[in-house]
């Protein structure tokens, strides 16, 4: 039975040209996290494998940095980065947990700076 829950940063906003940390946290389970996939719509951004380490998809390697922790840092944001992001936790023995984050990249300084995990 899957007892865990994923906490995420929820809906966040950031300024064009800035950076943002996407963060998820799996709680309420003793399942072992084997791998976390970060995806944007149907595109794989990065993988954090507990044993094999981080892999950043080649098309994103200039703008995506691993961490902190199992999170992902997006840099040099553009308006096109607006959209849904998913953290997919592959665990044993529970199976797969998925968290959703919606990022809005704003043109000017109207972005909220109070969001958790955000880089000023």
């Amino acid at each position: 039975m899957m007892t865990g829950t994923i906490e995420t940063t929820g809906n966040i906003s950031a300024e064009k040209g800035g950076s943002i940390i996407l963060q998820c946290h799996l709680s309420s389970t003793t399942a072992q996290v084997t791998q976390v996939n970060w995806e944007q719509q149907d595109q794989l951004l990065a993988i954090c494998n507990a044993d094999l380490g981080w892999h950043i998809s080649p098309s994103f390697k200039d703008r995506v940095a691993p961490g902190p922790g199992l999170g992902l840092t997006l840099q040099s944001l553009t308006v096109n980065d607006t959209g849904e992001y998913f953290c997919i936790y592959h665990t044993y023995p529970d199976g797969t947990y998925t968290g959703r984050i919606f990022l809005e990249v704003l043109e000017s300084s109207v972005a909220e700076h109070g969001a958790r995990f955000q880089i000023p």
């Epitope: 791998q35 996939n37 094999l52």
Partner: antibody, heavy 127, light 107 residues
Framework: EVQLVESGGGVVQPGRSLRLSCAAS????????MVWVRQAPGKGLEWVAS????????YYADSVKGRFTVSRDNSKNTLYLQMNSLRAEDTAVYYC????????????????????WGQGTLVTVSS | EIVLTQSPATLSLSPGERATLSCRAS??????LAWYQQKPGQAPRLLIY???KRATGIPARFSGSGSGTDFTLTISSLEPEDFAVYYC?????????FGGGTKVEIK
């Protein structure tokens, strides 16, 4: 730090038996699949056998099927390879290795790569 | 059984040069391919998994590419410690198989 230490190798006559052990430390042994790989002198690598984390499934190379048995004792953090009816062509350095699991989100299946290896133990089958 | 054929058998190069090693599978292994490095008297070391992903601690000069039946390991600029034997391995299905190896030696 993951450590794998093989033992039990030596010189044995054709047709006789030998049991290799692999003592594991530095990780949760019961959570990982384990494998045996061998390398004949001056030759390449040959996969010998695999066993799932809980010992429920075992897989063998055709060259050893029916003669070799892989097993594990999770309470002792130890992997074994029982080798019977040994032949000259079984002469090799035998390595144990721990798999690392990778989830392929395209084909929706796990793959197992041999990330951590012991230093090997030499088995010589000779009369 | 899936047969992996590595070429060339030996590659003679100088430090600083680029090394390109090939591995061809007798049938598709998708991206379920690994590359290992082995030095004399040592156990193999995992370099690349899933055809193109570097394992933890592997320098960026090592890169893998390919899928299906044709795969390549590239060492962008050879360091003295890179002279060794390299093996490809498929983990697509049992029996798991290794290629015959490519020896990268100092010219």
């Amino acid at each position: 730090e993951v450590q794998l230490v093989e033992s039990g190798g030596g010189v044995v006559q054709p047709g006789r038996s030998l049991r290799l052990s692999c003592a594991a430390s530095g990780f949760t042994f019961e959570s990982y699949g384990m494998v045996w790989v061998r390398q004949a002198p001056g030759k390449g690598l040959e996969w010998v056998a695999s066993i799932l984390y809980d010992g429920s499934n075992r897989y063998y190379a055709d060259s050893v099927k029916g003669r070799f048995t892989v097993s594990r004792d999770n309470s002792k953090n130890t992997l074994y390879l029982q080798m019977n009816s040994l032949r000259a062509e079984d002469t090799a350095v035998y390595y144990c290795a721990r798999v690392s699991y990778y989830y392929d989100s395209v084909e929706l299946r796990w793959a197992e790569y041999f990330q951590h290896w012991g230093q090997g133990t030499l088995v010589t089958v000779s009369s | 059984e899936i047969v992996l054929t590595q070429s060339p058998a030996t590659l003679s190069l100088s430090p600083g040069e680029r090394a390109t090693l090939s591995c061809r599978a007798s049938q598709s292994v998708s991206s379920y391919l690994a590359w290992y490095q082995q030095k004399p008297g040592q156990a193999p070391r995992l370099l690349i998994y899933d055809a193109s992903k570097r394992a933890t601690g592997i320098p960026a000069r090592f890169s893998g590419s390919g899928s299906g039946t044709d795969f390549t390991l590239t060492i962008s600029s050879l360091e003295p410690e890179d002279f060794a034997v390299y093996y490809c391995q498929q983990v697509h299905n049992f029996p798991l198989t290794f290629g015959g190896g490519t020896k990268v030696e100092i010219k």
